[in-house]
Interface confidence: low
C-alpha cells in the first residue's frame, strides 16, 4: 500500500494484496476491503455496473462473467481496484458485440478474457478472410482489442477475437464493425431553382439537397436577416454506405408579399459549412411589361422588308398575343417564343415580319398581349418611303400650269422652262402657289403637294418641266407650247420618269 | 463510447400526458440532429420527431404532429419529449436515437434501449 504523511486519508487496502487475481469456475470469489472510512464495492465489466455495501465481497460460485474490476471506495472518495479473472474453458471471451469505430481513430473490439494465461490474443477475419494488410491492433486481456486509426474500408468489417488454448485456436463470436466515417469535406448543397416569382397567396416550395458522407450533417433553411422558424420536411436516404442525401423541403402555404426575399439553405458538419441560396419575389399581382427592340416610329423605302419586334416580360404566363394593322388581326407573318428555355423564365420575344412594304401599307402596327391579371400594348407607327408620283399636270382654264405630285416624304415640285426644243431646262421658275393636300389626315400615306405657275410669263416657243423629288427619287412632266402670231398654241403635256 | 438512456414511461390514462427524456454521453451532443422512434408491440419501428442540433429546427410524424413537442437542452446534454392528447395508439417502446433518418432501414448510428409508454384506461 502507499505511503501516506499521518492524517492526511488514505485509499482503502484490499485483501489479497494484489492487483490480479485468478480463479477457477465454480471457486470462491472473497474480496476484503479495509478501511475506517468503508462506503461501498463497485464491480464493473463491460456495460455492467453492481454495487455492495458489504465491506467484504462474496461470491460463492464464481462464474466466467464475474471476471472484472472490483473497486473498494471510501467516504473520501479514495478507491483501490483488484481485477478478477474467473478462468472458464468454455467461455474464454466476455463480449458486447456493438462495435462502432470512427473513421481515423481507434475503436475497441470489447472482448476482454476471462483467462490471462492464453495465448495468441489477436483479431481474426470471419470465415477464414484475411483481415485488411493495414489493419493495426492492441490487445488487452481485460477491456478487448484496440483497432488503431479505424479506416473506411473497414465499414462492415466481420470479425472474430482469437486466443491459442492448449494448441487450438478458438474464436469469439463475430462482430461486424460499422465505420462512422469523419467529414473530410463541407457538404453539398444545391436548390432546386434559383428564384421564385409568385403571386400573393400561392404556394412556395423550394427543395434544397444536401450530400454528405453521413446522416450527421446538419442543415436548417434561414431567411436572410431574419430569425423567424421556418416549416421545412425532410426526406433522407443511403445510396451506399457512405453517401448520404437529405431534401429539406421548405414551404409557405400561401405567400404574401412581405415573404418576398433571399433564403438560405445551410449545412454544416465538423469539416466546415456550405449553403446556397434562393430568391424569392412575391407581387400582390400578376404584371407585363413590354420593351421595344426597334424605334416604335419606323421609315422604310417603298418595296423592302422591316421586322417589328418586341420583348415583354409577362407574370403569369401570357395567354394571348396579337399583332393588329388597321383593325384587322395578323394571322400569319409573326411569331412569338420565349427568351429563354429557363424553367424561371418570364421574358418573351415577339416578331412581326412586313415583307415587301406597299406605300399604302404604312400606318400603325399594334403588339397587344394579356395573361390572366393584366393586359398591355405597344404601338408602331411605320412610315413607307415612296418616290413621287405626279398625279396630274394640267393648264387650267385662268392660265395656271398646275402640277400634283404624291409621295413620302412630302415631294418638293421645281419649275423650269426649257426654250425651243433644248431638252436641258435650266431656268427655274417661281411658283405662284404651293399647297400641301392632306396636311391634316394621319401622316402615314403619301402626301400630295399642289404646285401652280403663271403660263403667262412665257413669251417664247419651248417646255415647261414640273420637277417632283423627295429623298426616295424623282419624276418629271413637261409642258409643250408654240406661238403662232399673237396666240399661244394648245399646250401638250407628258411626263418623263427621272430615277 | 456513445451512450444514450431514456426514463420518464409510464403507465397514463388516454389524454394523459407524459414527457420522455434522454441523457446522452460519449460524443458532442450539440453537433448532431437527435430522434426519437417507437415501437409498438408486434410492429416494426416508427420515426416520431427529429430535432437539429441548435434545436432550430424540429419536425414530426404526421401521426403526433400538433400533440407532441420534441426539444433538447444542449447544456444538460439531455433530449425532451413532451407528449399531450396521448392515444391507446401511442402504446409503445419509445427510443432516443442520433441521426435523422425517416425510415428505420436506414438505420440511426446510435440508440438508447428505450422506454415503455403505456396509454391505457
Known amino acids: 500500500q502507499p505511503s501516506v504523511s499521518p492524517g492526511e486519508p488514505s485509499p482503502p487496502s484490499i485483501h489479497p494484496g494484489k492487483s490480479d487475481l485468478i480463479v477457477r469456475v465454480g471457486d470462491e470469489i472473497r474480496l476484503l476491503c479495509t478501511d475506517p472510512g468503508f462506503v461501498k464495492w463497485t464491480f464493473e465489466i463491460l456495460d455492467e455496473t453492481n454495487e455492495n455495501k458489504q465491506n467484504e465481497w462474496i461470491t460463492e460460485k464464481a462464474e466466467a462473467t464475474n471476471t472484472g474490476k472490483y473497486t473498494c471506495t471510501n467516504k473520501h472518495g479514495l478507491s483501490n481496484s483488484i481485477y478478477v479473472f474467473v478462468r472458464d474453458p468454455a467461455k474464454l471471451f466476455l463480449v458486447d458485440r456493438s462495435l462502432y469505430g470512427k473513421e481515423d481513430n481507434d475503436t475497441l473490439v470489447r472482448c476482454p478474457l476471462t483467462d490471462p494465461e492464453v495465448t495468441n490474443y489477436s483479431l481474426k477475419g470471419c470465415q477464414g478472410k484475411p483481415l485488411p494488410k493495414d489493419l493495426r491492433f492492441i490487445p488487452d486481456p481485460k477491456a478487448g482489442i484496440m483497432i488503431k486509426s479505424v479506416k473506411r474500408a473497414y465499414h462492415r468489417l466481420c470479425l472474430h477475437c482469437s486466443v491459442d488454448q492448449e494448441g487450438k485456436s478458438v474464436l469469439s463470436e463475430k462482430f461486424i464493425l460499422k465505420v462512422r466515417p469523419a467529414f473530410k469535406a463541407v457538404p453539398v448543397v444545391s436548390v432546386s431553382k434559383a428564384s421564385y416569382l409568385l403571386r400573393e397567396g400561392e404556394e412556395f416550395t423550394v427543395t434544397c439537397t444536401i450530400k454528405d458522407v453521413s446522416s450527421s450533417v446538419y442543415s436548417t433553411w434561414k431567411r436572410e436577416n431574419s430569425q423567424t422558424k421556418l416549416q421545412e420536411k425532410y426526406n433522407s436516404w443511403h445510396h451506399g454506405d457512405f453517401n448520404y442525401e437529405r431534401q429539406a423541403t421548405l414551404t409557405i402555404s400561401s405567400a404574401r408579399v412581405n415573404d418576398s426575399g433571399v433564403f438560405m439553405c445551410y449545412a454544416n458538419n465538423t469539416f466546415g459549412s456550405a449553403n446556397v441560396t434562393t430568391t424569392l419575389e412575391v407581387v400582390d399581382k400578376g404584371f407585363i411589361n413590354i420593351f421595344p427592340m426597334i424605334n416604335t416610329t419606323v421609315f422604310v423605302n417603298d418595296g423592302e422588308n422591316v421586322d417589328l419586334i418586341v420583348e415583354y416580360e409577362a407574370f403569369p404566363k401570357p395567354e394571348h398575343q396579337q399583332w393588329i394593322y388597321m383593325n384587322r388581326t395578323f394571322t400569319d407573318k409573326w411569331e412569338d417564343y420565349p427568351k429563354s428555355e429557363n424553367e424561371s423564365n418570364i421574358r418573351y420575344v415577339s416578331e412581326l415580319h412586313l415583307t415587301r412594304l406597299k406605300g399604302t401599307e404604312g400606318g400603325t402596327y399594334t403588339f397587344l398581349v394579356s395573361n390572366s391579371d393584366v393586359n398591355a400594348a405597344i404601338a408602331f407607327n411605320v412610315y413607307v418611303n415612296t418616290k413621287p408620283e405626279i398625279l396630274t399636270y394640267d393648264r387650267l382654264v385662268n392660265g395656271m400650269l398646275q402640277c400634283v405630285a404624291a409621295g413620302f416624304p412630302e415631294p418638293t415640285i421645281d419649275w423650269y422652262f426649257c426654250p425651243g426644243t433644248e431638252q436641258r431646262c435650266s431656268a427655274s421658275v417661281l411658283p405662284v402657289d404651293v399647297q400641301t393636300l392632306n396636311s391634316s389626315g394621319p401622316p402615314f400615306g403619301k402626301l400630295v403637294v399642289q404646285s401652280s405657275i403663271d403660263s403667262s410669263a412665257f413669251k417664247h416657243n419651248g417646255t415647261v418641266e414640273c420637277k417632283a423629288y423627295n429623298d426616295v427619287g424623282k419624276t418629271s412632266a413637261y409642258f409643250n407650247f408654240a406661238f403662232k402670231g399673237n396666240n399661244k398654241e394648245q399646250i401638250h403635256p407628258h411626263t418623263l420618269f427621272t430615277p | 463510447e456513445v451512450q444514450l438512456l431514456e426514463s420518464g414511461g409510464g403507465l397514463v390514462q388516454p389524454g394523459g400526458s407524459l414527457r420522455l427524456s434522454c441523457a446522452a454521453s460519449?460524443?458532442?451532443?450539440?453537433?448532431?440532429?437527435m430522434s426519437w422512434v417507437r415501437q409498438a408491440p408486434g410492429k416494426g419501428p416508427e420515426w416520431v420527431s427529429g430535432i437539429g442540433p441548435d434545436g432550430f429546427i424540429t419536425y414530426y410524424a404526421d401521426s403526433v404532429k400538433g400533440r407532441f413537442t420534441i426539444s433538447r437542452d444542449n447544456s444538460k446534454n439531455t433530449l425532451y419529449l413532451q407528449m399531450n392528447s396521448l392515444r391507446a395508439e401511442d402504446t409503445a417502446v419509445y427510443y432516443c436515437a442520433q441521426g435523422d433518418s425517416r425510415s428505420w432501414h436506414n438505420s440511426f448510428d446510435y440508440w438508447g434501449r428505450g422506454t415503455l409508454v403505456t396509454v391505457s384506461s
Open positions: 460519449g460524443f458532442t451532443f450539440s453537433a448532431y440532429t
